[in-house]
């Protein structure tokens, strides 16, 4: 804590600028008004302050914004957010994609902070739901963003956001939470005709059940064997060798390089060994 | 760079209990998602088990009520306590560290046999 002491004359700051840099942490604290402070925050940025004197400005503005900081403020922080704990984020109501653009871009190329996660979250809660814009945003910064979130916190992200997943930010999801995304995903792309949905809904498909596979199977998708290494096994199970031959199209050769890995290996197993052998593959059920 | 150290595993009788543990070291960011996946000779990685960044949980339906995933956040550790074990539950344990950032890391493993 900065002692109060009096401004010396004509130290008096008028603007927030470079000579602030020589000031001492008690002539900042004396002679820098918050008001002014808070009004002219772009220019922080642009100033080389010391952590010491970033602390005495966001001291300033704590005296001055007891109930938590103005969006008007927050969207200037800059560097100053690096000061702010979760304890201070949690007052703040930010509306704007803009100030969350701003802020995520501060601590671009780093880990997620307690910070960022706390501003996050109360974005997102303010919003209501995890929209397409948010998730953009979002996903450009954390490409794991997606797959960090819970099958239950999944669940409430509306089919419309959907639009902004890219089949990169799904690569570290587990099986549960493509359970949840594959109906979203579904829901979002059903007006779209068969080869385009195949496209979007390709990234999806490790959550399909066996239906939707069996109705893949007559849109002549030619699924490559990638993504049929990753669909669920209990949903390719059922699936009948003809099916199956549908459903690969040109990529069915592939079977057999994959033939001891699952899902194949236990698809295999469960057909019988004449249909199998029309595939000509030399598959042994 | 994050690394990551499994134990706990060992060898144990049908219907009997172990707790693996997975300490993480590095940079993880905060609140990572760390997942339990196992490998059972001669087949494929598979998932076991999650802990989200809110610290919800999720399970594989073949170890569902009887596995147990839990974290101490303090000591950046996560845990798969094993009850009811059965042989099919043999394999190499792998725990996997996946930051927001998507970057993602695997332990070295640890090895659980159930006899009958």
């Known amino acids: 804590e900065v002692e109060k002491t009096a401004c010396p004359s004509g130290k008096k700051a008028r603007e927030i600028d470079e000579s602030l840099i020589f000031y001492k942490k008690w002539e900042l604290e004396a002679c820098v008004d918050a008001a002014l402070l808070a009004t002219q925050m772009d220019r922080v940025n642009a100033i080389p302050f010391t952590y010491e004197q970033l602390d005495v400005l966001k001291h300033k503005l704590d005296e001055l914004y007891p109930q938590g900081y103005p969006e008007s403020v927050i969207q200037h922080l800059g560097y100053l957010f690096l000061k702010m704990s979760p304890e201070d984020i949690r007052k703040w109501n930010v509306t704007s994609l803009e100030t969350l653009k701003a802020l995520l871009e501060v601590n671009k190329g780093h880990e997620m902070s307690p910070q960022v996660a706390t501003l996050i979250d109360r974005f997102v809660k303010g919003r209501g739901q995890l929209d397409k814009d948010t998730l953009d945003t979002l996903t450009a910064f954390y490409p794991g963003y997606l797959c960090s979130l819970s099958p239950e916190e999944l669940s409430s992200v509306p089919p419309s956001s959907i639009w902004a997943v890219r089949p990169q930010d799904l690569d570290t999801c587990d099986p549960r939470q493509l359970d949840v995304l594959y109906p979203k995903a579904r829901l979002a792309f059903q007006n779209m005709n068969g080869s385009e949905y195949f496209v979007k809904i390709q990234s999806f498909l490790g959550g399909a059940p066996t239906e939707d596979l069996k109705a893949l199977s007559q849109q002549n998708v030619s699924m490559d064997l990638a993504t049929f290494m990753k669909l669920r096994t209990d949903a390719v199970l059922p699936l009948t060798v003809a099916e199956v031959q549908k459903l690969l199209g040109p990529h069915v050769e592939g079977l057999k390089a994959e033939e001891r890995h699952r899902p194949v290996r236990d698809w295999i197993l469960r057909q019988r060994q004449d249909d199998l052998d029309t595939l000509g593959l030399g598959l042994q059920g | 760079q994050v690394h990551l150290m499994e134990s706990g595993g060992g060898s144990v009788q049908a219907g009997g209990s172990l707790r693996l543990s997975c300490v993480a070291s590095?940079?993880?960011?905060?609140?990572?998602?760390m997942r339990w996946y196992r490998q059972a000779p001669g087949k494929e990685r598979e998932f076991v088990s999650a802990?989200?960044?809110?610290?919800?949980?999720s399970y594989a339906d073949s170890v569902k009520g009887r596995f147990t995933i839990s974290q101490d956040n303090a000591r950046k550790t996560v845990y798969l306590q094993m009850a009811s074990l059965k042989p099919e539950d043999t394999a190499m344990y792998y725990c996997?560290?996946?930051?927001?950032?998507?970057?993602?890391?695997w332990g070295q493993g640890t090895q659980v046999t159930v006899s009958s």
């Open positions: 802990i989200y960044s809110d610290q919800t949980t």
């Open positions: 996997k560290l996946t930051t927001r950032r998507g970057s993602e890391y």
């Open positions: 590095g940079d993880t960011g905060y609140q990572p998602t």
